[in-house]
């Protein structure tokens, strides 16, 4: 069975084709090759002789037991080599020779018992080494690591490392890899020698499900003393053994580390006193809790020095009391409990993401809701009922505003956005908004992107509501049940580049409303009911137009519409997916491609 | 279409069939078997995925005695620092995991429950597997 040509001459998918040897009929120009799940078993010297351009090679689950010297020799362009799930028993010293551009090596679940004997010391370009799910017992980083000066990611998770000694990291002292991220999760650790991490700098350290008791966790964290880490991730996994007890003593050792960002990811334990618990983390710049249950919500009003707080997928009794002077970014998403939003006091806040919480807002939105006048980014998408009772008083700095898939009330009663002259991006898609007031977008003089799909208009008519949006470049009006539009609806949008009118109920096409859109490049009218043109004579669309989508409409392929069908043929170079432009009537032509039609109509004299 | 039996409990019988062409082997054990009146137990899965499990989610299509419920999307793996350790599993890596579950106090009426589980993962998104579970529910007299 042949391989699947994904990108001609470049990418080939040969997965699970029962190949016993490397295929010899693929072009020399192949850059990406997936040979996974084939019983190759043995890689001899110059196995990839005929693939001089190869950049990505996937050999997952190929039953490879032996890799000979020079197996990849001549793959000087290879950047990614994946060997996941191969039961390697014999790995020659020169197995990886010739890989002078290799950046990513994945040797997950390959029976690797030690880093010491892994022949990769010459791979100077290596950025990512993933040796997770192996049999490695010692964390001693071999001397050859001093050659791997570009290494950024080392994944040693799911191995058998129990202890870390001072000598294990000696090589890092010799060549501080300022950017190294290290994942040691799911190793059964019980001892970290104090001083092992002293004066070590890491970009990220991840330790999840490493400790089988609170005491072990405590002593191991104390063993990290002296570490300088940009981002520290601690926690557990839901489907692994969890700590039976967790209290403030667990994290006391963190006071002896220098941490820029901290994250606690999943804990099968109720956090009550977070002030005491995170006492050593009051001055990290970014603090993050993922999938934890928080009992006392008032604790977030303590004087933490965080600049970024992230609470994701957590459980709360009620919406937390947030009073944090220094906080600039708050991400509060996909949380449960506390369905009603209550005011927060965050005077430095610039970025606020409150999406996907099922929250309801009794009144939105003004400075008093968020306790800040500095807000630039506000995401309230995928929430409950949001009642618009204020026109963003004190929030004039806003540049990005997202309400999609929340239920907006009182949107058409006054100019809600009047004061948002700095707003660049607005998404009110699928918000149950019914446009019945022409001043709905007044004030948005800087707006560049407006998404309002899935809403509705009074009498299914699009009025002149965009008159002030002179900087708009992207407008999505899809799924709005529109049947007609004002001939001057788009007259002021001379910067508009993309207009999506798909999934509406237009029965005819008219070029007139688009005559002023001098910058229009994409016009999507797919999934309407267009049969013909509104006027007998259609003018040209703006000369800037590059893509016109008229697919999945109800074209009437009859003589009376001959001029319209001819006009469509004249637009051929603009049309996308022409094979999906089919006749709907008459029945004998149903399903026929419009462009292949040859209508010869007799003129009755 | 070959039917794979999972288990029987006092009020339910559970089996599944594949609803995709590939039918990559997957081993599913439930211990103790689910009782619909209330249940607590362990779900054990052994599987070798054909793509990375990063950003795994399930589309669930549930039918209760021929009545179709709306499609439900269950996100399992968000993409970073996920709840489940198997979210970091790579294509070709053995996934051998046990997940605890519990529920109580749900009143199920007698009949045939079908649940099509479409597992989607990776970037670009593609189907990982598709299983159709059938649960025959015989509420016992008590």
């Amino acid at each position: 069975e042949p391989c699947v040509e994904v990108v001609p001459n470049i990418t080939y998918q040969c997965m699970e084709l029962n190949f016993y040897k490397i295929p010899d009929n693929l072009p020399f120009s192949t850059k990406n090759l997936d040979l996974s799940f084939n019983p190759l078993r043995h890689l001899g010297s110059y196995s990839f002789f005929s693939f001089p351009e190869l950049q990505v090679l996937d050999l997952s689950r190929c039953e490879i037991q032996t890799i000979e010297d020079g197996a990849y020799q001549s793959l000087s362009h290879l950047s990614t080599l994946i060997l996941t799930g191969n039961p390697i028993q014999s790995l020659a010293l020169g197995a990886f020779s010739g890989l002078s551009s290799l950046q990513k090596l994945v040797a997950v679940e390959t029976n690797l018992a030690s880093l010491e004997n892994f022949p990769i010391g010459h791979l100077k370009t290596l950025k990512e080494l993933n040796v997770a799910h192996n049999l490695i017992q010692s964390f001693k980083l071999p001397e050859y690591f001093s050659n791997l000066t570009n290494l950024e990611h080392l994944d040693l998770s799911s191995n058998k490392i129990q202890s870390i000694y001072c000598t294990d990291l000696r090589v890092l002292h010799q060549m501080p890899l300022l950017n190294l991220s290290l994942d040691l999760s799911l190793n059964p650790m019980n001892f970290i020698q104090p001083g092992a991490f002293k004066e070590i700098r890491l970009h990220k350290l991840t330790l999840r499900n490493n400790f089988d008791s609170l005491n072990v966790m405590k002593t191991c964290i104390q063993g990290l003393a002296g570490l300088e880490v940009h981002r520290l991730v601690l926690g557990e996994f839901r489907n692994e053994g969890n700590l039976e007890k967790f209290d403030k003593s667990a994290l006391e050792g963190l006071c002896n580390l220098t941490i820029e960002e901290f994250r606690l990811a999943y804990l099968d334990y109720y956090l009550d006193d977070i002030i005491d618990l995170f006492n050593c983390l009051t001055n990290v710049s970014s603090f993050s809790l993922v999938s934890v249950t928080i009992e006392r919500v008032k604790d977030f009003s303590y004087n933490f020095g965080w600049q970024h707080l992230e609470l994701v997928n957590c459980k709360f009794g009620q919406f937390p009391t947030l009073k944090l002077k220094s906080l600039k970014r708050l991400t509060f998403t996909s949380n449960k409990g506390g369905n009603a939003f209550s005011e927060v006091d965050l005077p430095s806040l610039e970025f606020l993401d409150l999406s996907r919480n099922g929250l309801s807002f009794k009144g939105c939105c003004s400075q008093s809701d968020f306790g800040t006048t500095s807000l630039k980014y506000l995401d309230l998408s995928f929430n409950g009922v949001i009642t618009m009772s204020s026109n963003f008083l004190g929030l004039e700095q806003l540049e990005h505003l997202d309400f999609q898939h929340s239920n907006l009330k009182q949107m058409s009663e006054f100019s809600v956005f009047l004061s948002l002259r700095n707003l660049i991006y607005l998404d009110i898609s699928h918000t149950h908004t019914r446009v019945a007031f022409n001043g709905i977008f007044n004030g948005l003089s800087s707006l560049e992107v407006l998404k309002m799909a899935g809403n509705s208009f009074q009498e299914n008519f699009l009025p002149d509501i965009f008159t002030e949006l002179r900087n708009l470049t992207f407008l999505d009006l899809s799924q709005c049940q529109l049947e007609q539009l004002s001939p001057t609806a788009f007259n002021s949008l001379s910067s508009l580049q993309v207009l999506n009118m798909s999934h509406n109920n237009f029965f005819s096409l008219d070029t007139f409303p688009y005559k002023c859109l001098n910058s229009l490049q994409v016009l999507d009218y797919s999934l309407n009911h267009i049969m013909t043109s509104k006027k007998q004579e259609l003018q040209h669309f703006p000369s800037s137009l590059a893509f016109l989508n008229l697919t999945q409409n109800d074209f009437a392929c009859t003589c009376e519409h001959q001029s319209f069908l001819q006009w469509i043929k004249d637009q051929r170079q603009l049309l996308v997916e022409v094979e999906r432009m089919e006749c709907a009537t008459p029945s004998d032509k149903q399903g026929m491609p419009v462009l292949s039609l040859n209508i010869t109509c007799q003129m009755n004299k | 279409q070959k039917q794979y039996w999972v288990c029987n409990s006092s009020d339910a019988s559970i089996s599944y069939t594949y609803c995709d062409k590939m039918q990559y082997p997957i081993s599913i054990n439930v211990n103790p078997c689910i009782e619909l009146k209330r249940s607590k137990g362990l779900l054990h899965i052994f599987y070798i995925p054909r793509r990375d499990l990063k950003q795994l989610y399930f589309n669930l299509y549930i039918t209760v005695n021929t009545m179709n419920l709306p499609k439900r999307k269950e996100v399992i793996c968000r993409g970073s620092d996920d709840d489940y350790s198997f979210c970091r599993a790579l294509k070709g890596e053995t996934v051998n995991t046990t997940i605890s579950f519990s529920f109580k106090g749900i009143k199920f009426s007698k009949g045939k429950y079908k649940c099509v589980v479409e597992a989607i993962s990776g970037s670009p998104e593609e189907m990982l597997f598709c299983l159709e579970f059938v649960i025959l529910h015989q509420p016992n007299s008590n």
């Epitope: 040897k21 010899d24 009929n25 072009p27 020399f28 001899g44 010297s45 110059y46 002789f49 005929s50 | -």
Partner: nanobody
């Protein structure tokens, strides 16, 4: 088993030309691809050019594109490498290689090419 014998190497001035030949004998029916590699002192062996017997498709390394031409003479079971506009950085031992249908790679003994004024 396939045997390969190279010839045609030598000393040439920058800008000059050389033509290397590689004569194959033995199980030549099993050959899928043939090509030229080179190895400069202290460097890895690298692809120069490849030719596929089945369809005549050809590959050139970027460093030799437009200057070198690979060709074959079926009647003589020989593959050639015409090297024009030679540069000092083309100095290396040039090896002929053949890959058989069983994925086995056979090598010639190599021929020295020196580009120097």
């Amino acid at each position: 088993e396939v045997q390969l014998v190279e010839s045609g190497g030598g000393l040439v001035q920058p800008g000059g030309s050389l033509r290397l030949s590689c004569a194959a004998s033995g199980s030549i029916f099993s050959i899928n691809d043939m090509g030229w590699f080179r190895q400069a002192p202290g460097k890895e062996r690298e692809h120069v050019a490849l030719i596929r017997f089945k369809d005549g498709s050809i590959y050139y390394a970027d460093s030799v594109k437009g200057r070198f031409t690979i060709s074959r003479d079926n009647a003589k079971n020989t593959v050639y490498l015409q090297m024009n506009s030679l540069k000092p950085e083309d100095t290396a031992v040039y090896y002929c290689a053949a890959k058989t249908g069983t994925s086995f790679v056979c090598w010639g003994q190599g021929t020295q090419v020196t580009v120097s004024s």
